[in-house]
């Protein structure tokens, strides 16, 4: 299964993508930054097993998929950027799906980090807490896109390394 | 290793233009703003702008519209700081430095190692 | 603009010494502020941001406090090489300003 390499491919349309989404100037929203927590250290590991690091990043990508597909998110953004974002997003889910699939042969250990992924899903829970806080203001989204970049950037170096390994 | 790569020392009469750059590295270009700051012979430190270069959306402090442009060039990391018509008031130290945007992250964390920019006839 | 009001402008201390510096802003940036360093012929170097925190790097001895319009910057032992010039910069909105600096020298 090689979808660390496709994932690659996919992760990086996906930041273009998000990247073309701005709406407003982000230099208007500076009093608006937060700290959601990443959660650094899920991404840090050289622990996982190949099945559980995409599993983690599997959750990653479904949570991001969830916060762009409200309502909200489609009232704030360009709607033809959000539907190829979101086709984007889906792809990777079913290449995940596949690949994990693959792995579970061929190793024995579980399939789902459940810690690590408790962890993102309280991550992308906070996400949803700051815009709820902000009335889903064009700054918070704008704040929020910002993060979901920086955390698709992150995983993409523990992509990397997950390549490494092979 | 993350770098900020300042051009060197320019002497300038007054009136002539001049564009300085900041070359970044080691780190993703487009994910950093950069700022730009001003520091007069003896002085403090004075915010003159910043650049998202993703986009390239600018944004100056008052005290510098209009008397420069600060712009960058994505394909090569390098942001540029630039006058069309330099002063003799123009004469100090200029630096460049990254900012993590909207970003929960260290303001202003690297710095180039300025620009010594002289105007004197 | 936001103002940035530091204090003392200069002050001299002994290594050792327990040295505060002040900077309050002339409307609220929450934790929007940061310390910096700097040595002469030098670039700034980053102390604190977020008021607080703790630049990676840094010596414990630096520490930053306070939110909305009054911060402070202590130095908890001074060392030989602390001493320099300190800025707090402003973060909150643009456009981002400085304090005038403080210069801390060797009595």
């Known amino acids: 299964c090689d979808l660390p390499q496709t994932h690659s491919l996919g992760n990086r349309r996906a930041l273009i993508l998000l990247a073309q989404m701005g709406r407003i100037s982000p230099f208007s929203c500076l009093k608006d930054r937060h700290d959601f927590g990443f959660p650094q250290e899920e991404f840090d590991g050289n622990q996982f097993q190949k099945a559980q690091a995409i599993s983690v990043l599997h959750e990653m990508i479904q949570q991001t998929f969830n916060l762009f597909s409200t309502k909200d998110s489609s009232a704030t953004w360009e709607q033809s950027l959000l539907e190829k974002f979101s086709t984007e997003l889906n792809q990777q889910l079913n290449d995940m799906e596949a690949c994990v699939i693959q792995e579970v042969g061929v190793e024995e250990t579980p399939l789902m980090n459940v810690d690590s992924i408790l962890a993102v899903k309280k991550y992308f829970q906070r996400i949803t807490l700051y815009l709820t806080e902000k009335k889903y203001s064009p700054c918070a989204w704008e704040v929020v896109r910002a993060e979901i970049m920086r955390s698709f950037s992150l995983s993409k170096i523990f992509q990397e390394r997950l390549r490494r390994k092979e | 290793e993350v770098q900020l790569v300042q051009s060197g020392a320019e002497v300038k009469k007054p009136g002539e233009s001049l564009k300085i750059s900041c070359k970044g590295s080691g780190y993703s270009f487009t994910s950093y703003w950069i700022g730009w700051v001003r520091q007069m012979p003896g002085k403090g430190l004075e915010w003159m702008g910043i650049?998202?270069?993703?986009?390239?959306?600018?944004a100056y402090s008052p005290s510098f519209q209009g008397q420069v442009t600060i712009s960058a060039d994505k394909s090569i990391s390098t942001a540029y700081l630039q006058w069309s018509s330099l002063k003799a008031s123009d004469t100090a130290m200029y630096y460049c430095a990254r900012h993590p945007g909207l970003n929960w992250a260290p303001d202003f964390d690297y710095w180039g190692q300025g620009t010594l920019v002289t105007v004197s006839s | 603009d936001i103002q940035m009001t530091q204090s003392p402008s200069s002050l001299s201390a002994s290594v050792g010494d327990r040295v505060t510096i002040t900077c309050r802003a002339s409307?609220?940036?929450?934790?929007?502020l940061n310390w910096y360093q700097q040595k002469p012929g030098k670039a700034p170097k980053l102390l604190i941001y977020?008021?607080?925190s703790l630049q990676s790097g840094v010596p414990s001895r630096f520490s930053g406090s306070g939110s909305g319009t009054d911060f402070t910057l202590t130095i908890s032992s001074l060392q030989p090489e602390d001493f320099a010039t300190y800025y707090c910069?402003?973060?909150?909105?643009?456009?981002?300003?400085f304090g005038q600096g403080t210069k801390v020298e060797i009595k």
């Open positions: 977020f008021a607080s």
């Open positions: 650049i998202d270069p993703s986009d390239s959306d600018t």
């Open positions: 910069q402003q973060s909150n909105t643009l456009p981002f300003t």
């Open positions: 409307q609220s940036i929450s934790k929007f």
